[in-house]
């Protein structure tokens, strides 16, 4: 299931003397497309241009992150007169052109979405040959990837003075709320660290001092689901070691 916000248009005038107001470079992309991790999403992009009946070589490009300079994730090229845009680059083989660039459509399908795909994407078309021109969406389309929580790490670590602390890291979008439960704890939200920079979908919760032996469970929950994982603490009493 994919949700697309209402289209906005990037209408940009081309200053070529021979181009009338009706024939100008513009790109139509929605501001945002939402889809769940594991699913596929379609990034729509259509364009208009001032070069009537252009049938020369063309290249269609999608890049991520920022316009003009972000890394390419997809590129295909169509020879003069050809409707087939041959893929030259598809990052991890997950990007596929749905549209026909000859018909002013650069729409892209992204398969097997992951949270790391949550970023802004920019479509671009380049004409080569007799006419040589290019244009890229400057605002792009934000791909918003949602995901049920997944606990990626749970561990018990030594603390000063022979104490122990527990850490739980989960990912999800929206970022999940984390709670710890365990001996003499009840349900505790614990010290939740904000998502780390560059790891926007990761949340960590810490139990600073484990006072009792037994099973400690971390629960991660967001609007799409919940996940839990447990860790066991057993200290050898009379010794300074512990088994987890």
């Amino acid at each position: 299931f994919v949700r697309t916000k209402i289209d906005t248009t990037e209408n940009l005038l081309n200053t070529e003397v021979h181009s009338s107001p009706a024939q100008r470079w513009s790109m139509q992309v929605p501001p945002e497309v939402s889809a769940e991790a594991g699913d596929a999403a379609v990034l729509p992009c259509t364009f208009t241009h001032p070069h009537r009946h252009y049938d020369g070589p063309l290249t269609a490009i999608w890049r991520a992150g920022e316009p003009y300079a972000g890394p390419q994730v997809f590129r295909c090229a169509a020879a003069r007169g050809s409707e087939l845009c041959q893929t030259a680059l598809s990052l991890h083989g997950r990007f596929r052109l749905l549209g026909n660039p000859r018909r002013n459509d650069l729409s892209l399908r992204v398969e097997r979405l992951a949270l790391a795909d949550d970023r802004r994407y920019f479509c671009r078309v380049e004409f080569a040959g007799d006419v040589h021109d290019r244009y890229e969406s400057r605002h792009g389309v934000r791909l918003h990837v949602t995901a049920a929580p997944r606990i990626v790490n749970i561990s018990v670590l030594p603390s000063p003075a022979h104490a122990f602390r527990a850490l739980c890291t989960a990912e999800g979008e929206p970022p999940p709320a984390l709670a710890w439960s365990g001996p003499a704890l009840g349900n505790s939200l614990a010290a939740v660290r904000s998502p780390r920079e560059g790891h926007g979908h990761l949340v960590t919760a810490e139990l600073p001092a484990l006072t009792h032996d037994g099973r400690y469970t971390c629960t991660a929950a967001n609007s799409l689901g919940r996940s839990e994982a447990s860790v066991y603490l057993f200290r050898f009493h009379g010794a300074s070691g512990a088994s987890t």
């Epitope: 940009l12 005038l13 470079w25 290249t59 890394p71 090229a77 020879a79 080569a128 040959g129």
Partner: antibody
Framework: EVQLVESDGGLVQPGRSLKLSCAAS????????LAWVRQAPTKGLEWVAS????????YYRDSVKGRFTISRDNAKSTLSLQMDSLRSEDTATYYC???????????WGQGTLVTVSS | DIVMTQTPLSLSVTPGASASISCRSS???????????VFWYLQKPGRSPRLLIY???NLASGVPDRFRGSGSETDFTLKISRVEAEDVGIYYC?????????FGSGTKLEIK
């Protein structure tokens, strides 16, 4: 760090051929157009040729069309310029450059001198 | 071909003073709003050219903010405030709008 390193040029007689190459590193080679720009002794910069991402499209300045061939090997991250029927006016330092379109000729090699003389 | 005309051909500047270089194109380099294909390069003596400014006014990576580009359509200016000894060299404007891609003839900056 982006690096572009041209091969050695040299002295060549008029009418003869020479091939220049440029080894690139520090960026995703196939994501960019590449170009050759030359500079005659004590003169300004003159664009020579450009090649598209997958070598599907090449552009040349009129004075070298039919004599020079620009090519690239994305697997080896190398750019080449085959120069045939060389003339004395082709004498120049040749630079390979990464052509970023909206970002200009963003990175340049150190340059290699080609002298065409009998 | 688009002709890029630079003025002056050379200028001599006192350290700490400002310098201004003009570049005029024979055709508008405005492709669409916010997208103008004009660039400035500096070639220091015995070195390769280096990108200074892209798309009229954007500073390239590592370029000090003493350099400022401005202009539109056919008239462009590179201004260097507080000129330093290391700024000597030849400054070129260039266009990437149309093939053949062209450069100005260069402006030589010297320190008094």
């Amino acid at each position: 760090e982006v690096q572009l390193v041209e091969s050695d040029g040299g002295l060549v007689q008029p009418g003869r051929s020479l091939k220049l190459s440029c080894a690139a590193s520090g960026f995703t080679f196939s994501d960019y157009y590449l170009a050759w720009v030359r500079q005659a002794p004590t003169k300004g910069l003159e664009w020579v040729a450009s090649v598209s991402y997958d070598a599907i499209t090449n552009y040349y300045r009129d004075s070298v069309k039919g004599r020079f061939t620009i090519s690239r090997d994305n697997a080896k991250s190398t750019l080449s310029l085959q120069m045939d029927s060389l003339r004395s006016e082709d004498t120049a330092t040749y630079y390979c450059a990464r052509q970023d379109w909206e970002g200009g000729f963003a990175y340049w090699g150190q340059g290699t001198l080609v002298t065409v003389s009998s | 071909d688009i002709v890029m005309t630079q003025t002056p051909l050379s200028l001599s500047v006192t350290p700490g003073a400002s310098a201004s270089i003009s570049c005029r194109s024979s055709k508008s380099l405005l492709h669409s709003p916010g997208l103008t294909y004009v660039f400035w390069y500096l070639q220091k003596p015995g070195r390769s050219p280096r990108l200074l400014i892209y798309r009229v006014s954007n500073l390239a990576s590592g370029v000090p903010d003493r350099f400022r580009g401005s202009g539109s359509e056919t008239d462009f200016t590179l201004k260097i405030s507080r000129v330093e000894a290391e700024d000597v060299g030849i400054y070129y404007c260039g266009q990437l709008l149309e093939n053949p891609f062209t450069f100005g003839s260069g402006t030589k900056l010297e320190i008094k």
